[in-house]
């Protein structure tokens, strides 16, 4: 039940990307929504051999990936702040999962180029806006209220049934002819049924 509701809420989430509002904004699709998460694409020029890429949320470092080469041209890839990431020959993708309203913010790709020189830092970014559709909002608002109301009705129903059962039981205990009267009623009913059949 819990997982079902969770998937429902994930389905309700929508992602809107507003780029071009800040200096150094990405001139490509920076955010790709899939599988209940977001892929944040940080591009770098093909010529770049060694670099550090940091994903910033506002001013906070969320993730980083550093690619360097040794004197034998062996590649080393390191992450100090680990996120699920993917490296290609011209981009680093960082993946964020379990999105909620707190993820809505400016995201920046902070690229430090070590090689080829000169050392250079570039910052590109965009705003990741997370909102929910009206239908989902309404459902999410009324669903708990409906559930609560259902629970209250069930509790009241149980109380009522218990009370009626208790009342009936107590009245039958106080009436000495109660059992006889009940038997007589059953016999009368049997008789009339037989009469109906013969006619």
């Amino acid at each position: 039940m819990k997982s079902g509701l969770w998937y429902f809420f994930l389905f309700c989430l929508r992602i809107k990307v507003l780029t071009g509002e800040i200096n150094g904004s990405a001139n490509y699709e920076m955010f790709i929504f899939h599988n209940g998460g977001v892929q944040i694409l940080c591009k770098y020029p093909d010529i770049v051999q060694q670099f550090k890429m940091q994903l910033l949320k506002g001013g906070q470092i969320l993730c980083d990936l550093t690619k360097t080469k040794g004197s034998g041209n062996t590649v080393s890839i390191k992450s100090l702040k680990f996120c699920h990431s993917q490296l290609s020959n011209n981009s680093v993708s960082f993946f964020l999962y379990n999105l909620d309203h707190s993820h809505a913010n400016y995201y920046f790709c902070n690229l430090s180029i070590f090689d080829p020189p000169p050392f250079k830092v570039t910052l590109t970014g965009g705003y990741l806006h997370i909102y929910e559709s009206q239908l989902c909002c309404q459902l999410k608002f009324w669903l708990p209220i409906g559930c609560a109301a259902f629970v209250v009705v069930c509790i009241l129903g149980c109380i009522l049934i218990c009370w009626l059962t208790k009342k009936k039981y107590s009245s039958s205990v106080h009436d000495p002819n109660g059992e006889y009267m009940f038997m007589r009623a059953v016999n009368t009913a049997k008789k009339s049924r037989l009469t109906d059949v013969t006619l």
Partner: antibody
Framework: EVQLVESGGGLVQPGGSLRLSCAAS????????MDWVRQAPGKGLVWVSN????????EYSPFVKGRFTISRDNAKNTLYLQMNSLRAEDTAVYYC??????????WGQGTLVTVSS | DIVMTQSPDSLAVSLGERATINCKSS??????????LTWYQQKPGQPPKLLIF???TRHTGVPDRFSGSGSGTDFTLTISSLQAEDVAVYYC?????????FGPGTKVDIK
């Protein structure tokens, strides 16, 4: 200012062991690959070994593979070279070098290792 | 392993004259748009010093009389106007793959 200071060199008998150290300062040690390069008296430069920033990748020259071990302690900003089964041909000045992304951009003054009986 | 050779072994040049050192590799050092070749200068009693990287890019603080050229397997270091402080041994070095190797060196003296 980048500084690399080697120590631990000396005279050792063939088959013996030595541990060289290189104290680094003036830069973020844990951001760089580091290497050892040696130079026999009156001869040319020979690359010995390297190690990546975290110490997880190491490479060796065929001349020393299996006998030498490179390591680093980023907390102490120190590079090491453990040399076992030393031979006469290992006699050289051993330089600690910083691999500055595209070349050996900083060198220590070197420490002399003499292997002789 | 890639073998690096240098020529000449030594040369003597007059002050202010041009000095040219050649370096040849046993296989191409070109990868993408980069030649993985560096040049070092070693003065007597001193550790080596990085001069040129990627075959033709001068390192920080290196005088512009030093220049590097070449691609693939053939490279050249040129000192356009030799100064007294340029007396040294010059080494070419590749970092195309492991193990990186140095050339045997070329000794430059003043005539």
């Amino acid at each position: 200012e980048v500084q690399l200071v080697e120590s631990g060199g000396g005279l050792v008998q063939p088959g013996g062991s030595l541990r060289l150290s290189c104290a680094a300062s003036g830069f973020t040690f844990s951001d760089y690959w580091m290497d050892w390069v040696r130079q026999a008296p009156g001869k040319g430069l020979v690359w010995v070994s390297n190690i990546d920033e975290s110490g997880s990748i190491t490479e060796y020259s065929p001349f020393v593979k299996g006998r030498f071990t490179i390591s680093r302690d980023n907390a102490k900003n120190t590079l090491y070279l453990q040399m076992n089964s030393l031979r006469a041909e290992d006699t050289a000045v051993y330089y600690c070098t910083r691999w500055g992304r595209f070349g050996f951009d900083s060198w220590g003054q070197g420490t002399l290792v003499t292997v002789s009986s | 392993d890639i073998v690096m050779t240098q020529s000449p072994d030594s040369l003597a040049v007059s002050l202010g004259e041009r000095a040219t050192i050649n370096c040849k590799s046993s296989q191409s050092l070109l990868s993408g748009s980069f030649n993985y070749l560096t040049w070092y200068q070693q003065k007597p009693g001193q550790p080596p010093k990085l001069l040129i990287f990627y075959a033709s890019t001068r390192h920080t603080g290196v005088p512009d009389r030093f220049s590097g050229s070449g691609s693939g397997t053939d490279f050249t270091l040129t000192i356009s106007s030799l100064q007294a402080e340029d007396v040294a041994v010059y080494y070419c070095h590749h970092h195309y793959n492991a193990p990186p190797t140095f050339g045997p060196g070329t000794k430059v003296d003043i005539k």
